[in-house]
């Protein structure tokens, strides 16, 4: 007699960060033969779906046509086979962006630096927020948190060519409501050509300051759910 079902995977398409009034789909993948899926939001039942026919479908989608701050928060899903329910999925933090204002992102000493130089990003927003988020775009989207009354600083320390890329920042009004994104800042790190070719796509940051979101962008990551269960290292919690 089976006593447990593996927990399902949950993710958001196209992204866990959703601009206000835009659409998002929350996906939940369980097992073939699952009779029913339930999506829970902040601990309460939010939606139910029953795949038809169950034996041919192992994923359901919950569509949110119009994102707003009331829909932002923590989602999880469960499914059942017969009357046996799975463990709940990990938590998916769905964030609404483009709220209120736009911060300004700057970088010191400048956007073009030499490998080994110390680089600091500054994110400024004059309205009521004390938490800021710095994101580096790419296959893995790194999120770093910073605090300050109107400005937060994000020291990267001595940079390598792996730090090259496009950065944006957000002001955070709460864990799940973020400002408009800043204008992007492209960081160019020049260095030894041999080192450049060997540089990994993304740098490794100290565990206490950096979390990793593996995003469902057009990177082929959709193929392997285990890789991009958004909540594996959820910085927002």
């Amino acid at each position: 007699q089976q006593q447990t079902l593996p927990k399902p995977f949950i993710w958001a398409e196209p992204h866990f960060m959703v601009p206000k009034e835009k659409q998002v789909t929350i996906c939940c993948q369980g097992n073939y033969g699952a009779v029913e899926y339930q999506l829970h939001f902040e601990g309460s039942l939010f939606a139910v779906d029953r795949p038809k026919p169950p034996e041919r479908i192992n994923k359901v989608q919950f569509y949110i046509p119009d994102m707003n701050s009331r829909m932002a928060g923590q989602y999880s899903c469960i499914y059942r086979v017969g009357e046996l329910w799975s463990e709940p999925s990990n938590l998916l933090d769905l964030v609404v962006t483009e709220m209120y204002d736009t911060p300004t992102l700057s970088v010191h000493p400048g956007p073009e630096v030499i490998s080994g130089e110390k680089v600091t990003f500054y994110c400024r927003l004059d309205t009521a927020t004390s938490m800021f988020l710095l994101l580096k775009e790419g296959r893995s989207s790194h999120v770093q948190r910073g605090y300050g009354k109107v400005q937060a600083e994000f020291p990267l320390g001595p940079v390598t060519t792996a730090h090259r890329g496009t950065y944006r920042c957000f002001g955070s009004y709460n864990n799940h409501a973020w400002s408009f994104p800043s204008e992007p800042v492209k960081l160019l790190v020049t260095g030894d050509i041999e080192n450049t070719s060997l540089a990994p796509e993304d740098p490794t940051f100290p565990a206490d300051t950096w979390g990793t979101y593996l995003l469902t962008t057009e990177t082929g990551l959709q193929k392997d759910h285990a890789l991009w269960d958004h909540t594996a290292q959820n910085l927002l919690r």
Partner: antibody, heavy 117, light 107 residues
Framework: QVQLQQSAVELARPGASVKMSCKAS????????MHWVKQRPGQGLEWIGY????????EYNQKFKDKTTLTADKSSSTAYMQLDSLTSDDSAVYYC??????????WGQGTLVTVSA | DIQMIQSPASLSVSVGETVTITCRAS??????LAWFQQKQGKSPQLLVY???NLADGVPSRFSGSGSGTQYSLKINSLQSEDFGIYYC?????????FGGGTKLEIK
């Protein structure tokens, strides 16, 4: 072996409440949902709802939503059903039933509720 | 709510005969159907789950079949211990609902 031991008889006055118990043994209580089913004398079976003892999450048949409260005590592996504002229509046998991947696979012996002035 | 229409309501048969009880769902329940047997003064017992699968300890003379909205329980070579009331039940949506029951009596 799996056993669901229910309180045998509950007598109550109209308008009162009754809380019946279902003690589970022989399996991991928190791994399976517990459902409740009503059967009036000489009648068929009606599904009331279920509780997930692990999370406390409940789901009810709309017909019984205002009448019934399902709870579970993990420490004693016991599920409870409370019926409020009792009327003669609530006189019935109430079964607790384990929900598994095979459906309703184990049933308690039933609690007979008699509502009488 | 999904309605489960069970027929016949009662049946009078002799030991050794074969009987078929049918259950029709008001919508497709995708084989999420169970059959139960209940004897006088006892709790129901699971016979068949997921439309066709025999529960543990159920004799092979019982068999379930069907799909979509139409399901049936067949009992070959009836034994005296098979008499009682039979119920179908879906576990597709909420609320779970039972058929009205089929009373199987000795002729």
């Amino acid at each position: 072996q799996v056993q669901l031991q229910q309180s045998a008889v509950e007598l109550a006055r109209p308008g009162a409440s009754v809380k019946m118990s279902c003690k589970a043994s022989g399996y991991t209580f928190t791994s399976f949902t517990m459902h409740w089913v009503k059967q009036r004398p000489g009648q068929g079976l009606e599904w009331i709802g279920y509780i997930n003892p692990s999370s406390g999450y409940t789901e009810y048949n709309q017909k019984f939503k205002d009448k019934t409260t399902l709870t579970a005590d993990k420490s004693s592996s016991t599920a409870y059903m409370q019926l409020d504002s009792l009327t003669s229509d609530d006189s019935a046998v109430y079964y607790c039933v384990r929900g598994s991947s095979r459906g309703f696979d184990y049933w308690g012996q039933g609690t007979l509720v008699t509502v009488s002035a | 709510d999904i309605q489960m229409i069970q027929s016949p309501a009662s049946l009078s048969v002799s030991v050794g005969e074969t009987v078929t009880i049918t259950c029709r769902a008001s919508e497709n329940i995708y084989s999420n159907l169970a059959w139960f047997q209940q004897k006088q003064g006892k709790s129901p017992q699971l016979l068949v789950y997921a439309a066709t699968n025999l529960a543990d300890g159920v004799p092979s003379r019982f068999s379930g079949s069907g799909s979509g909205t139409q399901y049936s329980l067949k009992i070959n070579s009836l034994q005296s211990e098979d008499f009682g009331i039979y119920y179908c039940q879906h576990f597709w949506g909420t609320p779970r609902t039972f058929g009205g029951g089929t009373k199987l009596e000795i002729k």
